[in-house]
Interface confidence: low
């Protein structure tokens, strides 16, 4: 027989199928030009010493063979003795190690069997009613196809699925979408309506994330507030990456889970922007404010579950940084300015009350005054900090108030609102004899003492009603008792106590009269 023809004789090896798992498979035969044809197949197993024979049986029952040698591809013309206009059955027999291995048969009409390509270009993936929809442009001159898909997860083998017949210049497929695991898909096509036509190769992998991105498992820590009024948020534990099917490992196209950090600044609610979303890799600096931090995982199908943490406010206070002057027109605060053109947010809330009761005010951008101070003033009518109680004040600063991560804490301190000098007057002043020339003066703590750092000292005044001489005695803010010595028996005295702040003298308590009785010796 000539090598270009199909040989209608018995093949040169015994007819004995070994039944082994290895051997030829995936036989595909196509017309590749007006008069030429090609069959190709794959061989599984050791290839040394293997000879391949393409077998063909015509509808008449006559059979022939082509000897391909060690090649797994063979071309022939329409003059090779194989009927191309009628149905033929083809298979491959491989002779190796004194045994024959056979491929599955394909039955087809060669003339109408066109080599079909898998989806070649961009494959669009979208979610449709809980399923996955893939769409692609039909390869040139190949309208009319059956399409199959296969898919696998990291822990499961390939499963085959059917996309149904396609008859348009775009083709699509509805596939199952996994809730919690990534999938790898491949697609293949074959000619529609051509009985026994061969499947194309499988397409390149299409990697699909799970419908729900994995919940991020991360931990944060926050550093101490620095001199600049900012503290760094650091990530203690990176989020775990998604497990991927074999064909998606490495580049993992399409299965990426992106983690974003959403910051919500709870303090200073009057600022323009309260939330900011950042890449997880770019850990921000925060002011000393309270924040909620959420880590949001998302993939191409949208956001998944998130994890939220609360970062409490830094309550370290600066008792001396703030000056407050109370006048008839209102109150003015002064503090060391940060820089030129800074916007300040002043936040205050009654001590011991829920954080939701915080009030704040945003200043217009301001430059330092000649003394290097920034100021904020309010009138009595505004009602701000008007009640006679202790307030916790925090001042934040930013040159870019619209950028959440550029705020810094200037200071945190306590302030007693309303008419502090009157409200702070000590009550229940009492005098007890202590010795022949001294008395003990006691009083109830001033309301100012409920406000950390506000009460600077008590002053006790003693007046000799005879000589009109007055003496004043400073007392530590933590003390509510003092001993007055060097008093004379039989003289009338009055005693008063006041409570002073760093910027305000208190109002004297009601005068308390006393005298030390003259001791008569027997």
């Amino acid at each position: 027989c000539r090598t270009s023809e199909c040989c209608f004789q018995d093949p040169p090896y015994p007819d004995a199928d070994s039944g082994s798992a290895s051997g030829p498979r995936d036989l595909r035969c196509y017309r590749i030009s007006s008069d030429r044809y090609e069959c190709s197949w794959q061989y599984e197993g050791p290839t040394a010493g293997v000879s391949h024979f393409l077998r063909c049986c015509l509808s008449s029952g006559r059979c022939c063979y082509f000897a391909a040698g060690s090649a797994t591809r063979l071309q022939f013309s329409d003059q090779a003795g194989v009927s191309v206009l009628y149905t033929v059955t083809l298979w491959v027999e491989s002779w190796a190690r004194n045994q024959t291995e056979k491929s599955p048969e394909v039955t087809l009409q060669l003339y109408n069997s066109v080599k079909y390509e898998p989806p070649l270009g961009d494959i669009k993936v979208s979610k449709l009613a809980g399923q996955l929809r893939m769409e692609w442009e039909t390869p040139d001159n190949q309208v009319g196809a059956e399409v199959q898909f296969r898919h696998r997860t990291p822990s499961s083998p390939w499963k085959l699925g059917d996309c149904g017949p396609q008859d348009d210049d775009t083709e699509s497929c509805l596939c199952p979408l996994e809730m919690n695991v990534a999938q790898e898909f491949q697609l293949r096509r074959r000619q529609l309506g051509s009985q026994g036509s061969s499947w194309s190769k499988w397409s390149s992998p299409v990697c699909v994330p799970p419908e729900n991105p994995p919940q991020p498992q991360v931990r944060f820590s926050v550093e101490q507030l620095g001199q600049d009024g900012r503290r760094r948020l650091t990530l203690k534990e990176q989020p775990t990456q998604l497990e991927l099917p074999e064909g998606c490992q490495g580049l993992a196209p399409g299965t990426e889970v992106t983690y974003r950090l959403q910051l919500h600044m709870l303090s200073c609610p009057c600022k323009a922007k309260a939330t900011r979303t950042l890449h997880l890799g770019k850990m921000p600096y925060l002011s000393g404010a309270a924040y909620n931090v959420a880590v949001i995982s998302s993939n191409q199908f949208g956001p998944g579950l998130n994890q939220t943490w609360h970062i409490p406010a830094d309550t370290h206070t600066e008792p001396v940084a703030l000056n407050i002057s109370v006048g008839t027109n209102g109150t003015t605060m002064y503090w060391p300015a940060r820089a030129q053109s800074m916007t300040y947010c002043i936040e205050w809330q009654p001590v011991g009350q829920d954080g939701g009761l915080a009030t704040c005010s945003l200043t217009a951008p301001q430059d330092p005054d000649p003394a290097g101070m920034a100021t904020y003033s309010w009138s009595r009518e505004s009602g701000a900090m008007g009640q006679e109680k202790c307030y916790y004040i925090t001042i934040f600063a930013s040159a870019h108030p619209e950028k959440l991560t550029l705020w810094s804490t200037v200071l945190s301190t306590y302030h007693f609102g309303g008419n502090a000098s009157a409200a702070g007057t000590p009550h229940h002043v009492s005098v007890k004899n202590h010795s022949l020339d001294s008395v003990s003066v006691d009083w109830a703590p001033s309301l100012l003492s409920t406000c950390p750092g506000v009460l600077k000292e008590y002053v006790v005044r003693c007046r000799d009603e005879d000589s009109k001489q007055v003496s004043e005695h400073p007392v530590q803010p933590t003390e509510t008792q003092v001993t007055l010595s060097g008093l004379r028996a039989g003289v009338a005295y009055t005693v008063q106590v006041r409570a002073d702040t760093a910027w305000l003298r208190g109002v004297w308590s009601q005068p308390q009269r006393f005298s030390i009785e003259v001791q008569v010796s027997d």
Partner: nanobody
Framework: QVQLVESGGGLVQAGGSLRLSCAAS????????MGWFRQAPGKDREVVGI???????????DYGDSVRGRFTISRDDAKSTVYLQMNNLMPEDTAVYYC??????????????WGQGTQVTVSS
């Protein structure tokens, strides 16, 4: 920053077609999902179509329920442009159409950058 400029809006009869374009400049176009959103008078902004960045030979798209099957979103990363092909337009498609860049989500709040918008009016 990303700057976005929309074009292609106008007046069209019901059943007709329009193609909107959105040209992006600035930060790398490929790193953002691009979306078309629309807002009719007195209504909230809603998603029309979104297209994620291309990964290998795959890119990901999604659509709002009311336009699925009629509108097609595509993007040309080489030209930093995203397109919206609108077929079989209906009067209820009348709105200002905005192009946006951001995360691949159907919620318009996830988009950091916005164009000025282009008016599409569909007459019956």
């Amino acid at each position: 920053q990303v700057q976005l400029v929309e074009s292609g809006g106008g007046l069209v009869q019901a059943g007709g077609s329009l193609r909107l374009s959105c040209a992006a400049s600035g930060r790398t176009f490929r790193t953002y999902a691009m979306g078309w959103f629309r807002q009719a008078p007195g209504k909230d902004r809603e998603v029309v179509g979104i297209a994620a960045w291309k990964v290998a030979s795959t890119y990901y798209v999604d659509y709002g329920d009311s336009v699925r099957g009629r509108f097609t979103i595509s993007r040309d990363d080489a030209k930093s442009t995203v397109y919206l092909q609108m077929n079989n337009l209906m009067p209820e498609d009348t709105a200002v159409y905005y192009c946006a860049a951001g995360a691949f989500r159907t919620d318009w709040r996830s988009y950091a950058y916005w164009g000025q918008g282009t008016q599409v009016t569909v007459s019956s």
